[in-house]
């Protein structure tokens, strides 16, 4: 037989299929020009010493073969003895290691069998009613195709599916969408309506994320507040990355999960903007305010579930940094200014009440005064911190108040509101004899003592009603008792107690009269 012809003789090897797992497969035959044809196939297994034979049986029942040697592609003309206008059955037999391995058969009409391409270029993926929709441009001059897909997950083998007939300049396929695992898809096409035409190769992998992006498994920690009034937020664990099917490992566009940080500043509710989405790669520095932080995972189908953490406010207080002067027109606060043109947010809330009850005020941008101080004033009519109770005050600063990540904490402290000097007056002052020339003075703690750092000291005043001499005794804010000594028997005294803050002298308590009785010896 001539090498260019199909040889109508018995092939030069015994006719027996070994049935082994290796061997020829994926036989494709098609017309490549007006009079030339090509068949190609894959061979699975060791290729050394393998000889391939393309077998062909005509509709008459006569069969022939082409010897391809070690090649897995063979071309022939319409003069090679194979009927191209009528249906033929083709398969490959591979002779190796004294055994024959056979491919599955294809039955087709060679003249009408055109080589079809798989979807080429960009395959657009979208979600449609809980399913996956893939769409692509039909390859040139190949309108009219049957399309199949195969898909697998990281833990499952390939499954075959059908896209149905296509007859347009764009082709599409509806495929199953997995909720929680990534999938790899491949598509192939063959000529529509051409009986037994060969399938194209499989397309390049299309990698598809799960409908729900993986929920991030992360924890946050927050550092101590620095001298600049900011603290670093750090991520303790990186978000889990998606497990990918084999063909999607490495660079797999389409399956990327993007993690973002959503920051919600709970403190200072009167500021312009309360939330901001940030990159996980650029972890922010935060003020000492309270925040909610959420990690949002999203893929090409949109955002998934998020996890939210609460970052409590930094409660470190600096009792001396804030100066408060109360005048007839109202109250003014002074504190060390941060920089030029700063906006300050002053937030206050009654101690012991829910954080949601905080009130705040935003200043206009201000420069430091000649003493380097920033100020905030309010009138009595405004009602701000007007009740006689303890308030927790925090002052935040920003040169860009509309930018959430640029706020810093200036100070946190306590302040007793309303008429603190009167409200703080100690009550229930009592005097008890202590010795022949001394007494013990006790009183109930001032209301100011409920406000950390506000009560600077108690002052006990003792007045000799005879000589009108007055002595004053400072007492630590933690004490509610003092011993007055050097007193004379039979003399009338009055004692009063007041509670002072750093900026305000208290109001004296009601005078309490006492005397030490003269001791008469028997």
């Amino acid at each position: 037989c001539r090498t260019s012809e199909c040889c109508f003789q018995d092939p030069p090897y015994p006719d027996a299929d070994s049935g082994s797992a290796s061997g020829p497969r994926d036989l494709r035959c098609y017309r490549i020009s007006s009079d030339r044809y090509e068949c190609s196939w894959q061979y699975e297994g060791p290729t050394a010493g393998v000889s391939h034979f393309l077998r062909c049986c005509l509709s008459s029942g006569r069969c022939c073969y082409f010897a391809a040697g070690s090649a897995t592609r063979l071309q022939f003309s319409d003069q090679a003895g194979v009927s191209v206008l009528y249906t033929v059955t083709l398969w490959v037999e591979s002779w190796a290691r004294n055994q024959t391995e056979k491919s599955p058969e294809v039955t087709l009409q060679l003249y009408n069998s055109v080589k079809y391409e798989p979807p080429l270029g960009d395959i657009k993926v979208s979600k449609l009613a809980g399913q996956l929709r893939m769409e692509w441009e039909t390859p040139d001059n190949q309108v009219g195709a049957e399309v199949q897909f195969r898909h697998r997950t990281p833990s499952s083998p390939w499954k075959l599916g059908d896209c149905g007939p296509q007859d347009d300049d764009t082709e599409s396929c509806l495929c199953p969408l997995e909720m929680n695992v990534a999938q790899e898809f491949q598509l192939r096409r063959r000529q529509l309506g051409s009986q037994g035409s060969s399938w194209s190769k499989w397309s390049s992998p299309v990698c598809v994320p799960p409908e729900n992006p993986p929920q991030p498994q992360v924890r946050f920690s927050v550092e101590q507040l620095g001298q600049d009034g900011r603290r670093r937020l750090t991520l303790k664990e990186q978000p889990t990355q998606l497990e990918l099917p084999e063909g999607c490992q490495g660079l797999a566009p389409g399956t990327e999960v993007t993690y973002r940080l959503q920051l919600h500043m709970l403190s200072c509710p009167c500021k312009a903007k309360a939330t901001r989405t940030l990159h996980l790669g650029k972890m922010p520095y935060l003020s000492g305010a309270a925040y909610n932080v959420a990690v949002i995972s999203s893929n090409q189908f949109g955002p998934g579930l998020n996890q939210t953490w609460h970052i409590p406010a930094d409660t470190h207080t600096e009792p001396v940094a804030l100066n408060i002067s109360v005048g007839t027109n109202g109250t003014t606060m002074y504190w060390p200014a941060r920089a030029q043109s700063m906006t300050y947010c002053i937030e206050w809330q009654p101690v012991g009440q829910d954080g949601g009850l905080a009130t705040c005020s935003l200043t206009a941008p201000q420069d430091p005064d000649p003493a380097g101080m920033a100020t905030y004033s309010w009138s009595r009519e405004s009602g701000a911190m007007g009740q006689e109770k303890c308030y927790y005050i925090t002052i935040f600063a920003s040169a860009h108040p509309e930018k959430l990540t640029l706020w810093s904490t200036v100070l946190s402290t306590y302040h007793f509101g309303g008429n603190a000097s009167a409200a703080g007056t100690p009550h229930h002052v009592s005097v008890k004899n202590h010795s022949l020339d001394s007494v013990s003075v006790d009183w109930a703690p001032s209301l100011l003592s409920t406000c950390p750092g506000v009560l600077k000291e108690y002052v006990v005043r003792c007045r000799d009603e005879d000589s009108k001499q007055v002595s004053e005794h400072p007492v630590q804010p933690t004490e509610t008792q003092v011993t007055l000594s050097g007193l004379r028997a039979g003399v009338a005294y009055t004692v009063q107690v007041r509670a002072d803050t750093a900026w305000l002298r208290g109001v004296w308590s009601q005078p309490q009269r006492f005397s030490i009785e003269v001791q008469v010896s028997d």
Epitope: D228, R230, Y259, H279, L280, K282
Partner: antibody
Amino acid sequence: EVQLVESGGGLVQPGGSLRLSCAASGFTFSSYDMNWVRQAPGKGLEWISYINSRSSTIYYADSVKGRFTISRDNAKNSLYLQMNSLRDEDTALYYCAREIEDSMDVWGQGTTVTVSS
Amino acid sequence: QSVLTQPPSVSAAPGQKVTISCSGSSSNIGNNYVSWYQQLPGTAPKLLIYDNNERPSGIPDRFSGSKSGTSATLGITGLQPGDEADYYCGTWDSSLSAGVFGGGTKLTVL
């Protein structure tokens, strides 16, 4: 007035080194993240490097990774770019830029780096 | 080759409106904020739009920004000769952990 002023550019041979500086004034430098961006003659902007306010997070473009080093000295209100193993393609106008939440709101006037033998 | 794609040039007559597009992917524009910069001839870039559609103080409301999916658009109405400049879009790319710019668009006012 908020201002950034770059310096340190010049002519250098391939394989040589340069250190660019950026002096900041008119704002609290230590609170802001900073970037270097370059522009080759007649070309577009190319981001080079990012450093956060306390130098704890740094990023580089692939084109300069391993050759360039960004740093800052908050006490001196200064940003730096150490450029080693310079190549012809590093020839550009180099800008430093202040970043606020993903946008570069203040830019310097740039300093020119020419790499040529 | 820029990560973000912009048209090389656009032109329009004074008083007209023009739009400049910027397209990217889910790892940059799709999930991050977009900024627009104006670079007048011989000067440093200047921030024009931040957070997709916000204008810094001093930028006239003739300039606007928008974002949809993985694309962003800069709009300029009432064109003036002084608007002739190069315009760049910029954002962060979460996959690259890098800043990215478009190739720039030269605006000519006819």
